[in-house]
């Protein structure tokens, strides 16, 4: 009867580091000739194991006792499997040659070895520089070294799945795979407390996906608004200017007071008021001795936030004379958003 070479398993999946058994049985012991295992087909196939003594095959052993004279089981075991071992293996029966070398007479159908390698923990990176609300920023998630190729990657922001992503799976050797995914997110002012999660699901993870996260707090910038107000002090020759720096993030802040464009004082604040949305407020007080000024003075609150171009708010203290010995102070709203303070100076 015709010789049959049977590889019962079409595929075998094994975790990297474990052992894989590749089964092969023959239906007859004749014609005499060796059994050999190959990885791959055709010209490019490589010999993996031969049931001819004298050859050394590290990591590969025969499963049955092939020295039994009635042995028909030519299964092999590959130990400490690596992703490089993935591929299709063929059990091949040869007939001893008369003059020429042994000739191949029958091959098994092949067993594909899938090496299950876990993906690395996802690495999520955001933009190199901070962005402002309204801007679109990209997050990238990378995971390496998994096998087989099938993998699922999801992006979540505050628990909601994101779309607008671009995902690529690559492999240098078709042995293990890498995934890279980029998602675009439009920043909003409320995003300081937000975070983005890259979730990777793979057969090796047994239903427990791996997560990588990035906090928006590392990539968002909310620029402050400035507001200058004043409170009169007694004696009436003093005015307290208050610059309220509101709703900014992150804390990196320097505040300068200028008088007629000349630097008068610099604050490098350390204490801030926290807002519920994650932004901060800062208030700077500046005491103006109005009696020292005989003419209008423009006071500027200049804020440098997070290495961005300075933003400013101006406030004019306007000087004018009265005949009475009392002083008066009033606020005159101005179309150019300056506050004009009129102050009557005492005559000595």
């Amino acid at each position: 009867k015709e010789l049959k070479v049977t590889q019962a398993d079409k595929s075998v999946s094994v975790a990297a580091g474990d052992s894989a058994t590749l089964n092969c049985t023959v239906s007859s012991l004749t014609p005499v000739g060796p059994i050999k295992w190959f990885k791959g087909e055709g010209q490019n196939r490589s010999p993996i194991y031969s049931f001819i003594g004298g050859e050394h095959f590290p990591r590969i052993t025969n499963v049955s006792d092939a020295t039994k004279r009635n042995n028909m089981d030519f299964s092999i075991c590959i130990s400490n499997v690596t992703p490089e071992d993935a591929g299709t293996y063929y059990c091949v029966k040869f007939q001893k040659g008369i003059v020429e070398p042994d000739t191949e007479i029958k091959s098994g159908g092949g067993t594909t070895l899938y090496v299950l390698a876990k993906p690395s923990s996802p690495e999520v990176s955001g933009p190199d520089s901070r962005g402002s609300p309204g801007q679109t920023v990209n997050f990238t998630c990378k995971s390496y070294g998994f096998s087989p190729r099938n993998i699922t990657l999801k992006w979540l922001k505050d628990g909601k799945e994101l779309s607008h992503l671009e995902t690529t799976i690559s492999s240098k050797s078709n042995v293990s795979y890498n995934i890279s995914s980029t998602v675009s997110v439009k920043l909003s002012p409320e995003d300081i407390h937000s975070r983005v999660i890259c979730e990777v699901a793979h057969v090796t993870l047994e239903g427990r996906p791996l997560n990588g996260t990035a906090n928006f707090s590392n990539i968002i910038r909310v620029s402050p608004t400035l507001k200058i107000t004043q409170q009169p002090l007694t004696p009436a020759s003093q005015v307290n200017l208050t610059c309220q720096v509101q709703k900014f993030y992150p804390k990196a802040l320097q505040l300068n007071w200028l008088e007629n464009g000349n630097l008068s004082r610099t604050d490098k604040p350390e204490h801030f008021t926290d807002n519920r949305d994650g932004t901060y407020n800062y208030t700077s007080l500046f005491l103006v001795n109005s009696s020292a000024h005989r003419e209008d003075v423009v006071f500027t609150c200049q804020v440098e936030h997070d290495s961005q171009p300075a933003i400013t708010e101006n406030h004019t203290v306007r000087a004018f004379a009265h005949s009475s010995s009392g002083g008066s102070m009033e606020t005159i709203p101005d179309n150019n958003a300056y506050y004009n303070w009129n102050h009557h100076h005492h005559h000595h």
Partner: antibody
């Protein structure tokens, strides 16, 4: 270097028993099938027993089947031949031999003489 | 009786080529080997698997097969090659190891 050293030969009466030993060294004994081959004085070689590497399977020609038993102890790297109901025609030099993958012989011991005589 | 057949003797002059044949086994179920035995010594394997030579055996010894007949060829015969040569086989169909009766090689001169 592969070495096979037989021992246990001697003179025994017909119907008697004898146990031969073969100490192996220089190779992985537990990976190789082994055999006993004998040679009667002035005659040719005759295979008398074979055993698989694990020791579970044994093989004999009709001439000795039921009288001879081959065994091995892989922990001691030793091959044995238990010979019972010995006959005059069993007189021979007994060699142990290592088998190749296809059950031919590549290494031989120096032999031990068994004489069956009354 | 021996299952494999080989000539009882072969004579050859030094430097000549000696050929010893062995037949009787089924090609599809047999592997063959050749063993050399000098008087008072244990056999030495010259050829196994029909034509494979162990690394310690000189190249002048070679094996070949043609159908059910195998041949041991000794080229450039030397005086020390005088010995008995046995053909041995493994019969896959019966799980046995038959031998030929042996061939005495005489180196003339």
């Amino acid at each position: 270097e592969v070495q096979l050293v037989e021992s246990g030969g001697g003179v025994v009466q017909p119907g008697g028993s004898l146990r031969l030993s073969c100490a192996a060294s220089g190779f992985t004994f537990s990976s190789n099938a082994m055999s006993w081959v004998r040679q009667a004085p002035g005659k040719g070689l005759e295979w008398v027993a074979g055993i698989s590497a694990g020791g579970s399977d044994t093989y004999y020609p009709a001439s000795v089947k039921g009288r001879f038993t081959i065994s091995r102890d892989n922990s001691k790297n030793t091959l044995y031949l238990q010979m019972n109901s010995l006959r005059a025609e069993d007189t021979a030099v007994y060699y142990c031999a290592r088998e190749t993958w296809n059950h031919l012989f590549d290494y031989w011991g120096q032999g031990t003489l068994v004489t069956v005589s009354s | 009786s021996y299952e494999l057949t080989q000539p009882p003797s072969v004579s050859v002059s030094p430097g000549q080529t000696a050929r010893i044949t062995c037949s009787g086994g089924s090609y599809s179920s047999y592997y063959y080997a050749w063993y050399q035995q000098k008087p008072g010594q244990a056999p030495v394997t010259l050829i196994y698997s029909d034509d494979k030579r162990p690394s310690n055996i000189p190249e002048r010894f070679s094996g070949s097969s043609s159908g059910t007949t195998v041949t041991l060829t000794i080229s450039g015969v030397q005086a020390e090659d005088e010995a008995d040569y046995y053909c041995g086989g493994y019969d896959q169909s019966s799980y046995t190891n038959p031998f030929g009766g042996g061939t005495k090689l005489t180196v003339l001169g």
